[in-house]
């Protein structure tokens, strides 16, 4: 363990890991839910590791495949994360910004249809206010950068430099609420290219740009089967 | 196993059109794109294009006009077809399956463009 | 479209010596992947998203950059490693492959 910085050692040796690139490193290769300590050593927060796609270490924010979670929650929840790690969940947007306090994150976006076609994005940087102060007061800005196409087509570089936005705390640039026009909560801008915390709906859709969308793939009238969100350092 | 083939015609005229087929198996072409990569003798790698999961497809702008791809997913199969060919089209042509990158290529046909 | 210029073209070394292969991008890109291939022999994928080993690929190689600067390493050369070295990027279509390095052992 030579070389590694003193946090770092710290987390090592106490076995208190800060995502699942350091799961990985205690040598727990497989998909499933495991501890992190991203604000220190008291406070557990169970995460979905996906240690298997494209060489794994992925720590997963947000996951949703069958609409058994309501998605369509307050800044509250959002802020500090609600559902359960093995099945759909928001792993909590102050939970988001320790992360990438610390470490520098790439992000991965994997998507499916109702017709079992899966896609994804990438993007090389991804951080959550990673200059402010307060990160509640600046919003939890987004940060992505570095796209690179797996299918999906880029939906998220439209919302970079937003504030997030729930029905309760309305942030967008939009003269009405993006998050309860759209039912869902987002980075919104006015209003989006992706409401991955969208409605359920379940394939193709009538009412326009409410559902899991990601315009760039599957436009504003269809709503995906599965969506992860997740980070790794890079 | 992922594996990918490639089958062509090997011997086009100038002017022809090719065509080949990619038949894949040990992974489902609803969960991997496939990408094309062509290779001139005693040259450098050049990207054709690649079909996505859903059909969606991209090209090289540089031989968009004259290349086509698609595929049959029931069948596992990929199709690259190009008109017009030239002798510079003369070349081992690969299809490579996506994530991460291009993790598996074929073994690639070779296709030479003479009269 | 994003041009990738490798240097060098051709590098002959001795095996344990240290080897970097440079790909320079006429703009910025997201990451780069390396491919190793041997005459007569696919492509095979080295290194993604710049700095992941593919699988089966010795820790003696690793990759590194950004921006419009990336490179490939091995810090021990090893006879098995003599082939030609291609980057590649995929931030913008159409996908662009460098020009190759080739490496020969002496």
């Known amino acids: 363990v030579s070389g590694i910085r003193g946090d770092a050692l710290e987390r090592f040796c106490l076995q208190q890991p800060l995502d699942c690139d350091d799961i990985y490193a205690q040598g727990y290769q497989s998909d499933g839910v495991y501890l992190i300590y991203p604000s220190g050593p008291s406070v557990p927060v169970p995460v979905f590791c996906d240690m298997t796609t494209e060489g794994g270490k992925w720590t997963v924010f947000q996951k949703r495949f069958n609409g058994s979670v309501s998605f369509f929650r307050g800044w509250n929840d959002y802020k500090l994360g609600f559902g359960r790690a093995d099945g759909e969940y928001w792993l909590g947007l102050q939970n988001m910004h320790l992360l990438t306090l610390k470490q520098k994150y790439e992000l991965r976006v994997d998507l499916e249809d109702f017709e079992n076609n899966t896609a994804y994005a990438k993007y090389a940087d991804f951080s959550i206010s990673p200059n402010a102060v307060s990160a509640e007061e600046d919003g939890y800005t987004l940060f992505v950068a570095g796209f690179e196409d797996g299918g999906a087509g880029d939906s998220l570089s439209y919302h970079s430099g937003q504030k997030f936005s729930t029905f309760d705390r309305d942030q967008d640039l939009f003269v009405q609420n993006c998050a309860a026009l759209s039912s869902g909560a987002f980075w919104f801008r006015s209003c989006h290219f992706a409401n991955l915390n969208g409605f359920y709906l379940g394939g193709s859709h009538l009412s326009y740009a409410n559902g899991i969308n990601w315009a760039q793939w599957k436009g504003f009238y269809y709503s995906l089967k599965r969506t992860e969100m997740k980070i790794r350092r890079a | 196993e992922v594996q990918l083939e490639e089958s062509g015609p090997g011997l086009v005229a100038p002017s022809q059109s090719l065509s080949i087929t990619c038949t894949v198996s040990?992974?489902?072409?609803?969960?991997?794109?496939v990408h094309w990569v062509r290779q001139p003798p005693g040259k450098g790698l050049e990207w054709l294009g690649v079909?996505?999961?859903?059909?969606?497809?991209n090209y090289n702008s540089a031989l968009m006009s004259r290349l086509s791809i698609s595929k049959d997913n029931s069948k596992t199969q990929v199709f690259l077809k190009m008109n017009s060919l030239q002798t510079d089209d003369t070349a081992m042509y690969y299809c490579?399956?996506?994530?991460?990158?291009?993790?598996?290529w074929g073994q690639g046909t070779s296709v030479t463009v003479s009269s | 479209d994003i041009v990738l210029t490798q240097t060098p073209a051709i590098m002959s070394v001795s095996p344990g010596e240290k080897v970097t292969i440079t790909c320079s991008a006429s703009?910025?890109?997201?990451?780069m992947h390396w491919f190793q291939q041997k005459p007569g022999t696919s492509p095979k994928l080295w290194i993604y998203?710049?700095?992941n080993l593919a699988s089966g690929v010795p820790a003696r190689f690793s990759g590194s950059g950004s921006g419009t600067s990336y490179s490939l390493t091995i810090s021990r050369t090893e006879a098995e490693d003599a082939a030609t070295y291609y980057c590649?990027?995929?931030?913008?279509?159409?996908?662009?492959f460098g020009g190759g390095t080739k490496l020969e052992i002496k």
């Open positions: 490579a399956r996506d994530d991460p990158s291009m993790a598996y």
């Open positions: 040990g992974f489902s072409l609803t969960r991997y794109g």
């Open positions: 079909i996505w999961t859903a059909g969606n497809t």
């Open positions: 703009s910025s890109v997201s990451y």
């Open positions: 998203s710049t700095s």
């Open positions: 590649q990027q995929r931030s913008s279509y159409p996908y662009t």
